[in-house]
């Protein structure tokens, strides 16, 4: 997601399952850090935002024609799992060690 | 990149290699369609934007706290190669059938 004038980076985002209505099936944890990708994808794109060729092209076009095309976007490029205690189909508390794709591991410009 | 009020989708983006300064080494084509991912990632995220769990969580948090976190971003999730005729290190015109990651194949919310 787009942010202020800082460059694309991973920042903390505490998520409470009750706030998003997932407390009806996730028993624990009550909250977790999902992290968020925040900041701009400015020219020149640094190696740490692991830009694709398309992101580089789009950044160059944006530089030349800012109104024609937007900048590349700072998004999660690698996600991590979390462990959850959830209610299975029968409502029984069940442990999933690796609930995939729930937390940002790395951000990049895409 | 974020767009108007339409939902996340692939749109045409004609790129002229001269405009981005790549004509110095790319002989042909003179231009190509890089495509662009444009539009918003609105709740509820449709299947066609192949949202990750993190994108779904972020969308739900944005819904509850719009000022705390941005929406997920519409970005390329799959890229395609193009064929180029380029000058190699010695300036010899060389054909590369698959110059990877140059064109958007699919967009999604991340």
């Amino acid at each position: 997601s787009t942010g202020a004038s800082s460059h694309c980076q991973k920042t903390s985002l505490r998520v409470n399952f009750e706030d998003i209505g997932w407390d009806s099936w996730i028993i624990a944890p009550k909250e977790y850090d999902a992290y968020e990708c925040k900041g701009g994808c400015f020219f020149p794109l640094a190696d740490d935002v692991t830009p694709t060729k398309h992101a580089i092209v789009q950044t160059l076009v944006h530089l030349k024609f800012p109104t024609k095309v937007g900048k590349a976007c700072c998004v999660p490029t690698k996600l991590s799992p979390i462990s959850i205690l959830y209610k299975d189909d029968m409502g029984v508390p069940t442990l999933k060690y690796h609930y995939e794709g729930m937390s940002v591991a790395e951000c990049g410009c895409r | 990149s974020t767009g108007a009020s339409s939902h996340c989708q692939k749109t045409s983006l004609r790129v002229n290699f001269e405009d981005i300064g790549w004509d110095s080494w790319i002989i042909a084509p003179k231009e190509y369609d890089a495509y662009e991912c444009k539009g918003g990632c609105f709740f509820p995220l449709a299947d066609d934007v192949t949202p990750t769990k993190h994108a779904i969580v972020q969308t739900l948090v944005h819904l509850k706290f719009p000022t705390k976190v941005g929406k997920a971003c519409c970005v390329p999730t799959k890229l395609s190669p193009i064929s180029i005729l380029y000058k190699d290190d010695m300036g010899v015109p060389t054909l590369k059938y698959h110059y990877e990651g140059m064109s958007v194949a699919e967009c999604g919310c991340r």
Epitope: A28, L85, D88, M90, G91, V92, P93, T94 | -
Partner: antibody, heavy 126, light 111 residues
Framework: QVQLVQSGAEVKKPGSSVKVSCKAS????????IHWVRQAPGQGLEWMGG????????YYAQKFQGRVTITADESTSTAYMELSSLRSEDTAVYYC???????????????????WGQGTLVTVSS | QSVLTQPPSVSGAPGQRVTISCSGS????????VYWYQQLPGTAPKLLIY???NRPSGVPDRFSGSKSGTSASLAITGLQAEDEADYYC???????????FGGGTKLTVLG
């Protein structure tokens, strides 16, 4: 082979509390829940509650809510059941039993209580 | 009173077949798996049948479980003296969010 070994018999006065322990050996403690089931003399089995040590999350039968506390110590692979405000009707054999909680195990088996501890007799008498 | 209903006692002669019934409701047996436990005199319960009709290793194939609607039953064929025990059915109750047991059935092997 997972084994559950419980603490010894207890004699308690009405109004007091009792804390029974259940030590697990073999297997991974964080892979399972420990449940407590009691059996009054000549009576059937009655589920009291259980705990998932990985998160320290406990849940209880309505009947015992507020009077029972189930805890677990992952470092020693031991679960505890504390029952307060004891009355004579609480005289029973208290069993701990394991239930696998990891969803990597087939649901049919995941919901079974297996194995059980040997039981702890708690006598409440003035 | 137990949530799941079992007959207090059943009996049979050695070699015979006996069945123990367990009746519940849509929120327990009707929508969840049924488990059977055997409790020999003076010992802790032991898992006998899991997931309606599965036997853990070491349990003889003389024991079998079945489920239909909101009822379940345990069948024991070729009855032996060592089968004399209390038998309990058990299921998760989705509505009450608790594990429920039957009142138990005492099996007596005659003769």
């Amino acid at each position: 082979q997972v084994q559950l070994v419980q603490s010894g018999a207890e004699v308690k006065k009405p109004g007091s509390s009792v804390k029974v322990s259940c030590k697990a050996s073999g297997g991974t403690f964080s892979d399972y829940a420990i449940h407590w089931v009691r059996q009054a003399p000549g009576q059937g089995l009655e589920w009291m509650g259980g705990i998932i040590p990985f998160f320290g999350t406990a849940y209880y039968a309505q009947k015992f809510q507020g009077r029972v506390t189930i805890t677990a110590d992952e470092s020693t692979s031991t679960a505890y059941m504390e029952l307060s405000s004891l009355r004579s009707e609480d005289t029973a054999v208290y069993y701990c039993a394991r239930r696998i909680v990891s969803d990597s195990v087939a649901v049919q088996y995941r919901h079974a209580f297996d194995p059980w501890g040997q039981g702890t007799l708690v006598t409440v008498s003035s | 009173q137990s949530v799941l209903t079992q007959p207090p006692s059943v009996s049979g002669a050695p070699g015979q077949r006996v069945t123990i019934s367990c009746s519940g409701s849509s929120s327990n047996i009707g929508s969840n798996y049924v488990y059977w436990y055997q409790q020999l005199p003076g010992t802790a319960p032991k898992l006998l049948i899991y997931g309606n009709n599965n036997r853990p290793s070491g349990v003889p194939d003389r024991f079998s479980g079945s489920k239909s609607g909101t009822s379940a039953s345990l069948a024991i064929t070729g009855l032996q003296a060592e089968d004399e025990a209390d038998y309990y059915c058990n299921a998760w109750d989705t509505k009450a969010y608790v594990w429920v047991f039957g009142g138990g059935t005492k099996l007596t092997v005659l003769g």
